[in-house]
Amino acid sequence: RKIPKVGHTFFQKPESCPPVPEGSMKLDTGIINENQRVSMSRNIESRSTSPWNYTVTWDPNRYPSEVVQAQCKHLGCINAQGKEDISMNSVPIQQETLVLRRKHQGCSVSFQLEKVLVTVGCTCVTPVVHHVQ
Amino acid sequence: RKIPKVGHTFFQKPESCPPVPEGSMKLDTGIINENQRVSMSRNIESRSTSPWNYTVTWDPNRYPSEVVQAQCKHLGCINAQGKEDISMNSVPIQQETLVLRRKHQGCSVSFQLEKVLVTVGCTCVTPVVHHVQ
């Protein structure tokens, strides 16, 4: 899923208010829902018919510093016999997400949102192309 | 995948610099990689053996304003004959993501990051529990 462009008005104050300095806004440091509990998956990446591996990228000037990317293990899907069936396809499920980028210039620190494309997992699909060559 | 808590030091300046005002930082309004191209999938939500629907939630004080949630259509998975097979399970693939929350207090506008749990799609898994009732 793709994040649309940020609208021109999103960072603006109401019309009746004095304009804000061009280019920067106030970011509160707390994070809403930071402690929300997430149901941990029960190894779905290995039990899936379109299994995947994870790779971790790390950047100390990004929040979250750790971004996890999935890679589909197979071209096809795993059948009931545990064999790869290439009449079906493993395909990545991708999601555009936001991260916060920290920027230093001497003692000046500012932050900026950054779009990152994350592959979250894989699913098994019927191929579109059914040619016989 | 779960986003870890933001570290205490992430919003701090280097030790040799004067401290920043408690609670808020400077957010640049541009978005890095805003124009990155995303390969659009070809209806994988309907072609998957664990197909899903999408529901859109809208909030004008959030960026992105539109957050799309997937719901698995079936308990089981779709077999080669196009029938639901409940010896396999459709399960959601979830991703914690960040959104930017806009907060108004009169003419004062500030922003805060918020964690949102997004169901991105579904995958077909072999069940762990194999009871016969």
Epitope: R42 | W52, T55, C72, L75, I86, N89, L117, T119, V129
Partner: nanobody, 123 residues
């Protein structure tokens, strides 16, 4: 995290109908398979049926297929169980349950359970 609260139980005459509701709190209700179990006095907990996240797929235990109807309203974060032609043997505590996998839910291994609502059918 999901909290489940059942309601709608009570005393009903044999042959009557009842609709149970299960209100879920939590932002991702639609990502869960949800279903119903019941436990009669002195008996094991019994699976009634379940419904997929979108509501497109419903599975019933064979014995209840004709008299019980499961539905959900994701906009209201609510699961329903419509029961008709009730019999004395339907007397039980009815539990709502949620999990991201049908395989876990079906065999009573769900991650989330409600406290239950008592249904008593008098003959």
């Amino acid at each position: 995290e999901v909290q489940l609260v059942e309601s709608g139980g009570g005393l009903v005459q044999a042959g009557g109908s009842l609709r149970l509701s299960c209100a879920a709190s939590g932002r991702t209700f639609s990502s869960y398979v949800v279903g119903w179990f019941r436990q009669a006095p002195g008996k094991e907990r019994e699976f009634i049926g379940a419904i997929s996240g979108s509501g497109d797929s419903i599975y019933y235990a064979v014995s209840e297929k004709d008299r019980f109807t499961i539905s959900r309203d994701n906009g209201k974060n609510t699961l329903y169980l419509q029961m008709s032609s009730l019999k004395a043997e339907d007397t039980a505590v009815y539990y709502c349950t949620a999990d991201q996998e049908f395989g876990y839910l079906r065999f009573g291994r769900s991650e989330y359970w409600g406290q239950g609502t008592q249904v008593t059918v008098s003959s």
